[in-house]
Each structure stands twice: as structure tokens, then as C-alpha cells.
């Protein structure tokens, strides 16, 4: 893979340890927490990033209505188990033997159980709805300009091909970005929508995962777009399985 050869760093993941111990003295980078080798020419998987984050020292109407099966990441951070490819294992457990099933973006999709809980497959999240509220501006942004700039951002910064940005909706001050990527659409080398959404989420929070890259400076026709709230909904290819108790809570 390509890491910055001159100073041996990982441009796409600052939560790595890099050294020139690859084949032929090439720079090789390993993710903190897991020690797994990462491809620095593309985004690192969300699972490896979460694992690295948990190992690091702690620091302080045109709009879409998410479907009844949309998941929100209410559980927050946890130390995930990743498979050899860096994907989330379908079953995650904590230190107290409480287990649950997750989707491909690591969000819980079942009730919590014990070690007997079975998660037969890693269910793919094929539709992500990123719901943003921007800070007040003099006037509303032009919808088509906003759409174009956000598509450009996902292509330029996160390597996500425009075909996976299904739509951009705008009703001031709410912006919704729909990412869609079915298993059949994702070719070798394509960035996963879950990874792109995670990098975007961290960028929006001012916690960029890139090494030495400037922070996110999003502008629409020169006007800064500053986000004050983000909510992300995840839709899986198979609806989640929660008990009625949770649904009525």
C-alpha cells in the first residue's frame, strides 16, 4: 500500500503506528488497538478506527422521514471485535459477557443477551441518512449548489463515488444526505458508505482522522457551511430484531 514514504506516516489514519518494516523497507502502518496492517491509500474501516479510539488515552418535508427500521447509534463507543478484514464481527460482547448483534457499521440491531446469543451473519447497512442542521446564515443555500458541493466533498475527501450519494435534501436549516450502497453495487476498491459516513461524522465534530490534512472547510459558493447538529440513521438490508419492550419505550 502507499503510506507517505518520506516520513512514513498514514495519510488516511492518524491512529496508526508506522515503520519502514514492510517488504523492501516500505512503510507499513498498523492500527492502534488491533495491530492490524492498514491500507493508507484509502479509508480505514470503522471497526478498526473504533478499536483504535478505545485504546487511545481518553479525552475529555422534502426531507426524508427515517423508516421505522432506521437505527441510531444510541449505545455510543465500545471496544469492538473486528474480523481479519477489519469488518465488525456480527456478534459483539463486553467484558461482562453481555452480547448483541451489530450491522456492518457496528450499530446494535438486536436486544442485548448473553453468550448464548447467535448472530448468524453480518447484516449490511445499505442506506445511511445523515441529518445535519447548519448554523444560521444570511439566506438559505442554493439547493443545487449545496448538492454539488456535498457530492464533491464525499468524492474528494472520502473517495466515495458520486453514484453512492443517492440524494441531498435541503429544507433550511436541515440538510439530509442519503448514502446508498447495496452489496451488489460495491466493487473492489470502492469505499464503504459506513466508513465514509464515519469519517464525515468525525470531521464534522472537528476530530479529523486524517494525518496532516486540513480540517473540514465546507463552503457553498464561498459561504461557510457550519454544522451545529448531526444525527445519523442506519438502514439495514434485513430489518433489526428488537423486542416490543424496546419499541414502546
Amino acid at each position: 500500500h502507499t503510506a507517505a514514504q518520506d516520513n512514513c506516516t498514514c495519510p488516511t489514519n492518524k491512529m496508526t503506528v508506522c515503520s519502514p518494516d514492510g517488504p523492501g523497507g516500505r512503510c507499513q502502518c498498523r492500527a492502534l488497538g488491533s495491530g492490524m496492517a492498514v491500507d493508507c491509500s484509502t479509508l480505514t474501516s470503522k471497526c478498526l478506527l473504533l478499536k483504535a479510539r478505545m485504546s487511545a488515552p481518553k479525552n475529555a418535508r422534502t426531507l426524508v422521514r427515517p423508516s421505522e427500521h432506521a437505527l441510531v447509534d444510541n449505545d455510543g463507543l465500545y471496544d469492538p471485535d473486528c474480523d481479519p478484514e477489519g469488518r465488525f464481527k456480527a456478534r459483539q460482547c463486553n467484558q461482562t459477557s453481555v452480547c448483541w448483534c451489530v450491522n456492518s457499521v457496528g450499530v446494535r440491531r438486536t436486544d442485548k443477551g448473553d453468550l448464548s446469543l447467535r448472530c448468524d451473519e453480518l447484516v449490511r447497512t445499505h442506506h445511511i441518512l445523515i441529518d445535519l442542521r447548519h448554523r444560521p446564515t444570511a439566506g438559505a443555500f442554493n439547493h443545487s449548489d449545496l448538492d454539488a458541493e456535498l457530492r464533491r466533498l464525499f468524492r474528494e475527501r472520502y473517495r466515495l463515488h458520486p453514484k453512492f450519494v443517492a440524494a441531498v435534501h435541503y429544507e433550511q436549516p436541515t440538510i439530509q444526505i442519503e448514502l446508498r450502497q447495496n452489496t451488489s453495487q460495491k466493487a473492489a476498491g470502492d469505499v464503504d458508505i459506513g466508513d465514509a459516513a464515519y469519517y464525515f461524522e468525525r470531521d464534522i465534530k472537528g476530530e479529523s482522522l486524517f494525518q496532516g490534512r486540513g480540517g473540514l472547510d465546507l463552503r457553498v459558493r464561498g459561504e461557510p457551511l457550519q454544522v451545529e447538529r448531526t444525527l445519523i440513521y442506519y438502514l439495514d438490508e434485513i430489518p433489526p430484531k428488537f423486542s416490543m419492550k424496546r419499541l414502546t419505550a
Epitope: 491509500s41 474528494e156 458520486p162 453514484k163
Partner: antibody, heavy 120, light 107 residues
Amino acid sequence: EVQLVESGGGLVQPGGSLRLSCAASGFTFSTYTMSWVRQTPAKGLVWVSTINSDGYNIYYSDSMKGRFTISRDNAKYTLYLQMNSLRAEDTAMYYCARCSYYSYDYFDYWGQGTLVTVSS
Amino acid sequence: DIQMTQSPSSLSASVGDRVTITCRASENIDNYLAWYQQKQGKVPKLLIYAATNLADGMPSRFSGSGSGTDFTLTISSLQPEDVATYYCQHYYSNQLTFGQGTKLEIK
């Protein structure tokens, strides 16, 4: 007026190396994705490589990956293509091309090209 | 990789004729298709993007149509200055490919 001027082509022996340059002017270079495309009478136009505006995202044609390295210097308004282990089949006219601003990978401006000949 | 096949490879038509060139993708590419015009001894010039959008400065007699796998470039009334080779190119994936070209001549 957008201008792209390639240089660095010439005659090189098989196994040799060349570094092509493309000097850009007439637009804000640091905001555009850039590419190299080559052309031969036999194969027509063939995409070689693309680099995004800040140089973080790079794509290569599968058939050229490993031998060619694309890079850019935004301060100098210059795009580069380092070509190693050259083969006879790399003989072509090499064009530097600007991608559309919104990063859809089609080419809205092309340079005049620089000819690379690989022969012993 | 996605293969792009143009037909015909060459064609000859009279001034004023309606000319169509087709481009077929080996798999669905939605509307991620561009057409270029390259005159003899010149560099390629963007003609159409997103399958149907005419590039700035190109004459309105050129138009593009199609989506999915089948695309057409049409010249409504052929002019002498349209003599060139025309190429299609997909940008649906990260591996970009061009058609082999269609050489257009005047009868």
C-alpha cells in the same frame, strides 16, 4: 484561459524511467482533481491515473499500478507522472487532463501532450 | 473493468446528414458517460458529459442520449468541421475506460 503544458517526454530504453510534468495555469490548480491519459494509434485513449485536489486520493489503472506514480505540487501548479520499468507498450502520447470541478471523472481540459518512446 | 464498445468504427456521411454513433457499456453505468471529439492532430475536447449535457462552447447540433448500457451521440446536421474521431468514456467506477473511437468522414 485554462492551459496545461506537458513536458518530460522523449526516447528511453526498456526498463528505464521518465518523469513527466504538467504545468497548469489559468485556474486554481489546488481545487481540481487531475489525471494522466495516454494515446496510441493501436489502443486509442487509455486512462493512466488520477489524483485528487489535495493529493490524498490517488487512483491508477490496474494495468499500470506499481510502475507509475502520480503526484502534484499545488504551490507550483504542477502535476507529475513518474514512470519506472518502462516497456515498449508504454510508447504513447501522454496527456495531462483536468477533471471536472465536481470530481466526476471526465476531462474538461486537456494539454497538448508529450510523446514518450520506449525503444532500444 | 467495464468495457466500452463503439459502433461503427468509422463512417462516412454527407454534409447536412443526421449522424448517430453508439456506445455500449459491458454493464450498467447509469448516466456516467462522456463523449469527446478529437480532430486530426489535435487534442481531445469534451463534447458531452453525464450522457446528455452539452459541454460549454460546443455546437447545439450535437446531442447525447441513453442511460444504463446503451448511449448515442447524434449530430443533427453534419458540418465539414465535424470531421473527427469521437470517443465515449465511462466514469461509473474508479477504473475509467474509453471506447475505441469512431472516425467520422465527409463523403
